[in-house]
Interface confidence: low
């Protein structure tokens, strides 16, 4: 049963945000119209992110199942580019609104996502 009729505008929701085994940070968002995913780096503990990060790979996924009526976009960045502690923001937005997810980033340590979003 579709939760959203095709063409109904919906604010992006971030479906997954993960650190992959190859060191990539990946963010997957769904919404209508198709969300844009932008990446930002915030030095230190500040969550005011201004330095834009160029994604290494972006694709629109074919979604035959949930979330119905939404377009799903996957974007990845290469974490090896970061040399300082800080936070990485994945921001998904479209004409309706925006949603962000954050990764804590510690140089030469593991990256783990915050388990909260900013809307």
């Amino acid at each position: 049963q579709p939760s959203v009729s095709p063409g109904e505008n919906t604010k992006p929701e971030i479906l997954t945000y993960d650190r992959l085994v190859n060191g990539m940070l990946q963010c997957v968002a769904a919404g209508f119209p198709e969300p844009t995913i932008d990446w930002y780096f915030c030095p230190g503990t500040e969550q005011r992110c201004s330095a834009s990060v160029l994604p290494v790979d972006v694709q629109t996924l074919n979604s035959s199942g949930p979330p119905f009526g939404k377009l799903v976009v996957q974007s990845s960045i290469d974490s090896s580019a970061f040399k300082h502690n800080g936070t990485v923001e994945c921001k998904a937005y479209n004409d309706v609104g925006k949603t962000s997810a954050y990764f804590n980033f510690a140089f030469k340590e593991q990256i783990h996502p915050h388990h909260h979003h900013h809307h």
């Epitope: 190859n22 060191g23 198709e34 290494v56 790979d57 972006v58």
Partner: antibody, heavy 117, light 110 residues
Framework: EVQLLESGGGLVQPGGSLRLSCAAS????????MQWVRQAPGKGLEWVSS????????QYADSVKGRFTISRDNSKNTLYLQMNSLRAEDTAVYYC??????????WGQGTMVTVSS | DIQMTQSPGTLSLSPGERATLSCRAS???????LAWYQQKPGQAPRLLIY???TRATGIPDRFSGSGSGTDFTLTISRLEPEDFAVYYC???????????FGQGTKLEIK
């Protein structure tokens, strides 16, 4: 140092074939979308083809669709462009470039392909 | 398909002057996917700006990008001798996936 180095260009007759290679170094090749872009003598840039990091999805400009095939070998850090049924209008410098849909951030120096009888 | 038109075709200016290069799309698109490149004779293109206004790594702050919808601008605030080159804008369209370059603007010394 991040680097892309094209090879395989040369002179070929119309209807002939050529295979271009692009050797990547200094970055994790298998993580990146890659593309071929060409530039005819004295003309502007024209996107030719793109391939996703895994190689599972490819895109082509209409002008080369059905004649050119992009591929990659992530174990060799190498990108390829197989060009068949070549035409005079395919004469150009062919660049490989790294990047995503946002932009192409690293380019090779190019390899010249001349199609002439 | 979206067409990208750059103007002027040639721009003649002197070092120290301000350069304004225009790129117009035949239809509106997502501004995240507008980039600018610089190309000098015999060299490969170099990425200057992506996402309409973000400078690529190592690009001096005299280069700036702006715009939205169909009209985009590359501005070089104070021309240096090494800035004289050809500049291309580039757009990405996702349906079908393809990349479109403008025809280029040649920035030459007056």
């Amino acid at each position: 140092e991040v680097q892309l180095l094209e090879s395989g260009g040369g002179l070929v007759q119309p209807g002939g074939s050529l295979r271009l290679s692009c050797a990547a170094s200094g970055f994790t090749f298998s993580n990146y979308q890659m593309q071929w872009v060409r530039q005819a003598p004295g003309k502007g840039l024209e996107w030719v083809s793109s391939i996703r990091p895994s190689g599972g999805s490819t895109q082509y400009a209409d002008s080369v669709k059905g004649r050119f095939t992009i591929s990659r070998d992530n174990s060799k850090n190498t990108l390829y462009l197989q060009m068949n049924s070549l035409r005079a209008e395919d004469t150009a410098v062919y660049y490989c470039a790294r990047g995503s849909s946002h932009a192409f951030d690293i380019w090779g120096q190019g390899t010249m392909v001349t199609v002439s009888s | 398909d979206i067409q990208m038109t750059q103007s002027p075709g040639t721009l003649s200016l002197s070092p120290g002057e301000r350069a304004t290069l225009s790129c117009r799309a035949s239809q509106s698109f997502r501004s995240s996917y507008l980039a600018w490149y610089q190309q000098k004779p015999g060299q490969a293109p170099r990425l200057l700006i992506y996402d309409t206004s973000t400078r690529a790594t190592g690009i001096p702050d005299r280069f700036s990008g702006s715009g939205s919808g169909t009209d985009f601008t590359l501005t070089i605030s104070r021309l240096e001798p090494e800035d004289f080159a050809v500049y291309y804008c580039q757009q990405y369209g996702s349906s079908p996936p393809m990349y479109t370059f403008g025809q280029g603007t040649k920035l030459e010394i007056k």
